[in-house]
Amino acid sequence: KKVVLGKKGDTVELTCTASQKKSIQFHWKNSNQIKILGNQGSFLTKGPSKLNDRADSRRSLWDQGNFPLIIKNLKIEDSDTYICEVEDQKEEVQLLVFGLTANSDTHLLQGQSLTLTLESPPGSSPSVQCRSPRGKNIQGGKTLSVSQLELQDSGTWTCTVLQNQKKVEFKIDIVVLAFQKASSIVYKKEGEQVEFSFPLAFTVEKLTGSGELWWQAERASSSKSWITFDLKNKEVSVKRVTQDPKLQMGKKLPLHLTLPQALPQYAGSGNLTLALEAKTGKLHQEVNLVVMRATQLQKNLTCEVWGPTSPKLMLSLKLENKEAKVSKREKAVWVLNPEAGMWQCLLSDSGQVLLESNIKVLPTWSTPVQP
């Protein structure tokens, strides 16, 4: 018996060939001997089967002794043994129809689970072999689960259903809803304007939800909500904002926040959460602010940074075009009785300068000038 695999929703063509290369009488029946279709001369006749409106043949092939059964918009329950009766012969074809679907929405939040469910006919024992957009293979039976979805899992998943050494292939498009970056860090000199951007890693027609930025300042004992906002069809509207600092927010995507001034008391880390309509869970992006201040008080030139710096970052003070006078893996460095000239305070990571602040030290009878 010939086995043919079909895909739910697709069209399948079951072949039946006579030895005579001419149009002769044929009938297609199901396993219950109910007639599906056949011919009367050059006319197509249909029986009382459930396939009635979805069954067809190719009259153009009859003259060549080919009498196919075409079944459109396949359903799992179309799985059956189909019998072609022609020239006193019976040709049996077993049709197995499979469906593979994501059991929830195909738009999933980062960190959520994807479950692919295989619909299969009774008595079949298929295996499913799926490949993610980044090339990772996963195997399963009736269900196949992937936990902790990552951004790279967005895209087309390709799956092969195997049954009796035959296969049917599926593609499922998955969108992982996430921010482009899980975390970002902004380095600013005291007094500079700060721009925070939260670009999304996906595009959808309509985007509705609400969000909030919580901030944990280094100097503060607890975190506080800096801003809450709504998102309606990609338009941003601010609901509530603190008075200190007075944040401003862009009205369009990507989500964009402006802090008028970088001050030591704002240095710290924040967590922007975005709850999307009809989705359980939230999107998160961490943002960090590091603020630098260079000052001269009497005979002491000091450079300080506030905010989340890693232990490997180097803070140094140097007179322009000279070797660093002081360089430490600490958050404050100073020079006593600094020479006159333009001093540079540098925050660097493996030689790469992240933040720089200049301060002019005048001869001792003057007061310092900060450019």
Epitope: P133, G135, N137, Q139, T156, T158, E169, K171
Partner: antibody, heavy 118, light 106 residues
Framework: QVQLQESGPGLVKPSETLSLTCTVS????????WNWIRQPPGKGLEFLGY???????NYNPSLKSRVTISRDTSKNQFSLKLSSVTAADTAVYYC????????????WGQGTLVTVSS | DIQLTQSPSSLSASVGDRVTITCRAS??????LNWYQQKPGKAPKLLIY???RLHSGVPSRFSGSGSGTDYTLTISSLQPEDFATYYC????????FGQGTKLEIK
């Protein structure tokens, strides 16, 4: 019987683009996964990338910026382009089929030697 | 990248011998381990896929086993045509190959 046949120039100049085509008979490239693998003389095998039945591609991360795989379903062919080649890209290049998605290459072309030299 | 280490790199054996080649992965590859045979000047031939499934047309003297990070190819009784280089290859993620095991006549 499934057959794969690589074709393309055997000599490519450094910094140029290596272009190879794999012609498939006995199977359709709109089913399964179609791969490129190479083997430098006297060395082991290295996976370059694949194109799937769904026209999705994936490349070896170490070569990603230089590799492109595409297909022409009307000719039942798929192609490899490797840009900015150096002498280190001299190898026998194979195309191969992975029918069921296990990255198990069950049919291979006979391979074509590409030499990178000025 | 998942690294595969084959051992031994080469071995000498006689016709009729039982031979075992091992392949160790740098991380769990979930049984996605394939074995190939290659003869000089020829393309590799698939022997075993998904740890233990024999590819069609491959003699039953070839078998595969293993799980997690450790996998084995066994040839139960060496035939003259089996002298070749054998490669393991993981298919859990984008493929990587072992460095090969050259099987020579003693």
């Amino acid at each position: 019987q499934v057959q794969l046949q690589e074709s393309g120039p055997g000599l490519v100049k450094p910094s140029e683009t290596l272009s190879l085509t794999c012609t498939v008979s006995g199977d359709s490239i709109t089913s399964g996964y179609w791969n490129w693998i190479r083997q430098p003389p006297g060395k082991g095998l290295e996976f370059l990338g694949y194109i799937s039945f769904a026209d999705t591609t994936n490349y070896n991360p170490s070569l990603k910026s230089r590799v492109t795989i595409s297909r022409d379903t009307s000719k039942n062919q798929f192609s490899l382009k490797l840009s900015s080649v150096t002498a280190a890209d001299t190898a026998v290049y194979y195309c191969a089929r992975d029918d069921y998605g296990y990255y198990a290459m069950d049919y291979w072309g006979q391979g074509t030697l590409v030499t990178v030299s000025s | 990248d998942i690294q595969l280490t084959q051992s031994p790199s080469s071995l000498s054996a006689s016709v009729g011998d039982r031979v075992t080649i091992t392949c160790r992965a740098s991380q769990d590859i979930d049984n996605y381990l394939n074995w190939y045979q290659q003869k000089p000047g020829k393309a590799p031939k698939l022997l075993i896929y998904y740890t233990s499934r024999l590819h069609s047309g491959v003699p039953s003297r070839f078998s595969g086993s293993g799980s997690g990070t450790d996998y084995t190819l066994t040839i139960s009784s060496l035939q003259p045509e089996d002298f070749a280089t054998y490669y393991c290859q993981q298919g859990n993620t984008l493929p990587t190959f072992g460095q090969g095991t050259k099987l020579e006549i003693k």
